[in-house]
Structures are given as structure tokens and as C-alpha cells.
């Protein structure tokens, strides 16, 4: 088979400057970005603005309450995870604008894209911890009265962060920069090369531990909680429960495309048409997953407005009302009763 029967293929327009006409892809298509990449850029921009400001506000609101209010500890840690991930966005944005050229070096390639995975694991483990907390409040109120304290909450968060770091290590280790010869471009990605089995193992572990198992346990957990709370007329408020259910639901909705494409790509040959198609959608899937980093503050504000009727209060006080609502009776009027039954409501503030 011979495909060399042409005269002058002139590759001159590809370079004459060090980073090339990076914008002229090999297939000689236009300089414009692909539609999925443009959508990803729009999402990244919105997520960065909302995520940085929103999560910074949540951190500010909850930081003051975190010493004494357990809910504040949960939401503070979630906001920190989201805020950290948002910090990587300008660099990911720049890379997509440059047609996935990565001029930031090997260290940045290992660390920055791993932040989103750290966020995923930290978020899901924190959500699991929060869900366990809600479950115990409903089903083991006496135990909560005796043992549920800020110290234990911080230990649970530390364990969640530690496990998240541990689960992020494989992706961190396999991230490399590859300088392609033509068109001259440096790419940042994972390279398992000889070890397709390990790539599949990492993808399966990520799907199971970061998605399926939490989905199953949280679904069971909240089904029981909702059944219990709806069966008890004594329950005054389910505000925190609604917020947490919304956060959990959004987590699974926005991570779904990333997880599905990730598992598919690990089982496909890199040269196959399906792999190449999914690879083109990769940035969009990542950006969709990144929505998680800004959605929580939005949920908190929406929840706050729902309970306030109108946005009469200042944003910080509205957030404070949602995020630091304790699951027990407090003297302060800013706290409302939660999903615990009447017996647990008699317990003192933690």
C-alpha cells in the first residue's frame, strides 16, 4: 500500500516558531477549537468564577462555626476540597485553549490534573461521612448524644482526606508529559504503556470506590433516613437532609460521564475510532465533573432562599443559616430543629 504519490507536502506552515502553529492540527483542519472543547472552556470559566468565590464564602462562613458545629465541619471540608480543585482550572483552561499543549512542565502535569481526582475522592468520602452522620442521628440518637462531637468529626474528615490522597496516588504516578514530534506539542496525560491491565484496574477501582459503591451505600442510607423522617410527624425540619441529598445527587450526576468514558477508554485500543471519539470528549467530561466544585455553594444558597422565602438576608448570614444548622436544639435562633426524632432533640448542643 503506497500513499506517497503526491508532489510537495510543504509542512512549513506548521512551525517557524517554537510552539508551532499549534493551532494547525495534523489533519489540516481549521485553527478553531472543537465544539466539546469550547463547551468545556465555557464550563471551566463559570466553574472557576462561581467555585472560587462561592467556596471561599462557604469556607469563611463555616470556619468560624467549625469549632462547635459539626455540620459546619462537614461543609467546610467539602468547600476546601472544591476550592483546591478550582485553583487548577486556569491552567487546564490555558492548555485547552492551546489545543491541549502543556507548557507547564512535568511536576504541574502530575499535580494539577490529580487535584480533580483528589476532589472526587475527598468529596465522596466526606459525603459518605456526612451520610453516616445523618443516619446515626436518625437511628442512633442516644449514641450521638454521648459520642457525636467536633473532635470525632475532625478525625473522620482527616481519615477521608488521607484515603482520598491514597486513592489519587496511582493516577499521580502514571501522569507524564509527552512531547509529540509533529505537530510540535507537549501533552500531559496518563501513560500505562506496557500495563493495560493496571490501567483497567485503576479505572475499575475509581469507578467502584469513587462512584458505584458510594452510590449504593448512600442510596440505601438516604432511603432509610427518608422513610424514617416521613413516617414521623414530630420532625420539624429536614433542611440539612435536603441539602445533603441535593449535594449527593449532583455528585453522581456530574461525575457520571467522566466515569463512563474513563472505564470505556481503559478497555479500548488507543487507535480505535471509539477511543478517539471519547478522547475528544475528555475535556468536556472533566469540565462536567468540575461542576461539582461550584454546585454546592449554589445548592446552599438555593436552600437558604427556599427557607428564607426571599433573599432578604445577606449572603453570608443566609449561608450560615444553611450550613451551621445543628442537628439538635440550640438556644440561638439561627439554628433549627433537624431530622432527629423528638428524643434526640432533647440532647444538648455539640
Amino acid at each position: 500500500m503506497n500513499s506517497f504519490n503526491y508532489t510537495t507536502p510543504d509542512y512549513g506552515h506548521y512551525d517557524d516558531k517554537d510552539t508551532l502553529d499549534l493551532n494547525t492540527p495534523v489533519d489540516k483542519t481549521s485553527n478553531t477549537l472543537r465544539v466539546p472543547d469550547i463547551l468545556a472552556l465555557v464550563i471551566f470559566a463559570v466553574v472557576f468564577l462561581v467555585g472560587v468565590l462561592g467556596n471561599a464564602l462557604v469556607v469563611w462562613v463555616t470556619a468560624f462555626e467549625a469549632k462547635r458545629t459539626i455540620n459546619a465541619i462537614w461543609f467546610l471540608n467539602l468547600a476546601v476540597a472544591d476550592f483546591l480543585s478550582c485553583l487548577a482550572l486556569p491552567i487546564l483552561f490555558t492548555s485547552i485553549v492551546q489545543h491541549h499543549h502543556w507548557p507547564f512542565g512535568g511536576a504541574a502535569c502530575s499535580i494539577l490534573p490529580s487535584l480533580i481526582l483528589l476532589n472526587m475522592y475527598a468529596s465522596i468520602l466526606l459525603l459518605a461521612t456526612i451520610s453516616a452522620d445523618r443516619f446515626l442521628l436518625v437511628f442512633k440518637p442516644i449514641w450521638c448524644q454521648n459520642f457525636r462531637g467536633a473532635g470525632l468529626a475532625w478525625i473522620a474528615c482527616a481519615v477521608a482526606w488521607g484515603l482520598a490522597l491514597l486513592l489519587t496516588i496511582p493516577s499521580f504516578l502514571y501522569r507524564v508529559v509527552r512531547e509529540e514530534y509533529f505537530p510540535p506539542k507537549v501533552l500531559c496525560g496518563v501513560d500505562y504503556s506496557h500495563d493495560k491491565r493496571r490501567e483497567r484496574a485503576v479505572a475499575i477501582v475509581r469507578l467502584v470506590l469513587g462512584f458505584l459503591w458510594p452510590l449504593l451505600t448512600l442510596t440505601i442510607c438516604y432511603t432509610f433516613i427518608l422513610l424514617r423522617t416521613w413516617s414521623r410527624r414530630a420532625t420539624r425540619s429536614t433542611k440539612t437532609l435536603k441539602v445533603v441529598v441535593a449535594v449527593v445527587a449532583s455528585f453522581f450526576i456530574f461525575w457520571l460521564p467522566y466515569q463512563v468514558t474513563g472505564i470505556m477508554m481503559s478497555f479500548l485500543e488507543p487507535s480505535s475510532p471509539t477511543f478517539l471519539l471519547l478522547n475528544k470528549l475528555d475535556s468536556l467530561c472533566v469540565s462536567f465533573a468540575y461542576i461539582n466544585c461550584c454546585i454546592n455553594p449554589i445548592i446552599y444558597v438555593v436552600a437558604g432562599q427556599g427557607f428564607q422565602g426571599r433573599l432578604r438576608k445577606s449572603l453570608p448570614s443566609l449561608l450560615r443559616n444553611v450550613l451551621t444548622e445543628e442537628s439538635v436544639v440550640r438556644e440561638s435562633k439561627s439554628f433549627t430543629r433537624s431530622t432527629v426524632d423528638t428524643m434526640a432533640q432533647k440532647t444538648q448542643a455539640v
Epitope: D27, E179, Y181, P270
Partner: antibody, heavy 121, light 112 residues
Framework: QVQLQQSGADLAKPGASVKLSCKAS????????IHWVKQRPGQGLEWIGY????????KYNQKFKDKATLTADRSSSTAYMQLSSLTYEDYAVYYC??????????????WGQGTTLTVSS | DVVMTQTPLSLPVSLGDQVSISCRSS???????????LQWYLQKPGQSPKLLIY???NRFSGVPDRFSGSGSGTDFTLKISRVEAEDLGVYFC?????????FGAGTKLELR
């Protein structure tokens, strides 16, 4: 027909510099990149770098960045490689090669006959 | 740098034999455009190398059909179905996906 005619064998002293040439004919010189490859006696091939004769854009293997300098003279359709600070390690056959490919300059389709560089005091 | 490991380094053959030469890369050679830029060259004694196979399995113009290439990702093979006298020499695999471009150490095909 396409031809890459390289300069004859060269003898140089350690520490000196040499300039090897590669004259192209039978095609439009500015339309194809010229690569340079090193082959030590009885050993494999090592890529040195390339030059795009149209705009004099060059790319080097890091290993040869301080050793080789690639240039091109469009008027005579000749590519040059200057090797500086010669050592005994530079004793080798040096090839120039033209690259081609439908999607980009990926394959060496035509090679020069090679220039043997001997480094001896 | 991508290390290209060829096996065997020496291959004694008889004319008419079918032979296989293996080439393994230290990194995946799949380009972001989906293609794999793996070439095979033959260098006969006292000559410059000649292109045989490009993009893993495509024969260059004028190359006999007894030469065939296969493989993907990191593992590649060159097969010669019936060795002829003109096939003797050193076979090099080469990649042009990543910078720097690299070559295998070579496999010497010689008569036993």
C-alpha cells in the same frame, strides 16, 4: 529523481569544528524538512535534529543541542550541520535524510550516502 | 526518551525462511491523532538505510509484499515471509511519534 548528495569524508582534530553539507536535488528544497542522523561504527542510529529549510526552524535532540548547529541555504538547496568542540565520541557516519508522509513529516524516504567524520589528533 | 528494544540482535537464517523481528517501545507510540508512527528500515552493508514499512504496517513504494509489519501501542513485529539474499542486512525499527525520534539497536539478518 530525488537525491541528497553529502560532502566527502572529513578528518578533524579534537576541539575543532566541522561543517558537513547535504545538497538536495530533484524536488522543491523548501517543501521538505531535512533531518540529520548519527551512526557510530557498528552501532545503531541516533537522531540529531531537523531543519525546515523554508523558515530555518530547527529542532534538536537535547543530547546534541550544544554539539550541532543546523542551517540551510535556499539559493543552493543545501542543508548544513556544524559540529563543534569535537571529541572522539563524534567519530561516526552522519546522514542527512528527507522526511515525508501524507499526514506530516514522519518518515525518512530519501537518505544521503553519509559523511564519515574521523576525529584524530 | 523512548527506548526502542529490538530482539533478536542477530538472526541467522537460510534463504526461503520465514522470520520475525520484534521491537518494543518504553512508551506508547500512539499519537494524539490516533496513528502510530513506527517505521522499519533496512540498512545493507556500506549503504544508507532504506524505508520498508511506515505507520506500523504500510509498505513503502517498491517494497516487496513478503515484508509485513504489525503491532500496536508498544509491541511491534516485522515479518519476512521468504527471505531472499537481497534482504540481508541490519533492520532498524524507529519511532517518530515523540521527541526525540529514536531507533532500535538493530537486528542483523545474516546467513547461517
Amino acid at each position: 529523481q530525488v537525491q541528497l548528495q553529502q560532502s566527502g569524508a572529513d578528518l578533524a582534530k579534537p576541539g575543532a569544528s566541522v561543517k558537513l553539507s547535504c545538497k538536495a536535488s530533484g524536488y522543491t528544497f523548501t517543501s521538505y524538512w531535512i533531518h540529520w542522523v548519527k551512526q557510530r561504527p557498528g552501532q545503531g542510529l541516533e537522531w540529531i535534529g531537523y531543519i525546515n529549510p523554508r523558515g530555518d526552524y530547527t529542532k534538536y535532540n537535547q543530547k546534541f543541542k550544544d554539539k550541532a548547529t543546523l542551517t540551510a541555504d535556499r539559493s543552493s538547496s543545501t542543508a548544513y550541520m556544524q559540529l563543534s568542540s569535537l571529541t572522539y565520541e563524534d567519530y561516526a557516519v552522519y546522514y542527512c535524510a528527507r522526511v515525508t508522509g501524507t499526514e506530516g513529516p514522519y518518515y525518512f524516504d530519501y537518505w544521503g550516502q553519509g559523511t564519515t567524520l574521523t576525529v584524530s589528533s | 526518551d523512548v527506548v526502542m528494544t529490538q530482539t533478536p540482535l542477530s538472526l541467522p537464517v537460510s534463504l526461503g525462511d520465514q522470520v520475525s523481528i520484534s521491537c518494543r517501545s518504553s512508551q506508547s507510540l500512539v499519537h494524539s491523532n490516533g496513528n502510530t508512527y513506527l517505521q522499519w528500515y533496512l540498512q545493507k552493508p556500506g549503504q544508507s538505510p532504506k524505508l520498508l514499512i511506515y505507520k506500523v504496517s504500510n509498505r513503502f513504494s517498491g517494497v516487496p509484499d513478503r515484508f509485513s509489519g504489525s503491532g500496536s501501542g508498544t509491541d511491534f513485529t516485522l515479518k519476512i515471509s521468504r527471505v531472499e539474499a537481497e534482504d540481508l542486512g541490519v533492520y532498524f525499527c524507529s519511532q517518530s511519534t515523540l521527541v526525540p525520534l529514536t531507533f532500535g539497536a538493530g537486528t542483523k539478518l545474516e546467513l547461517r
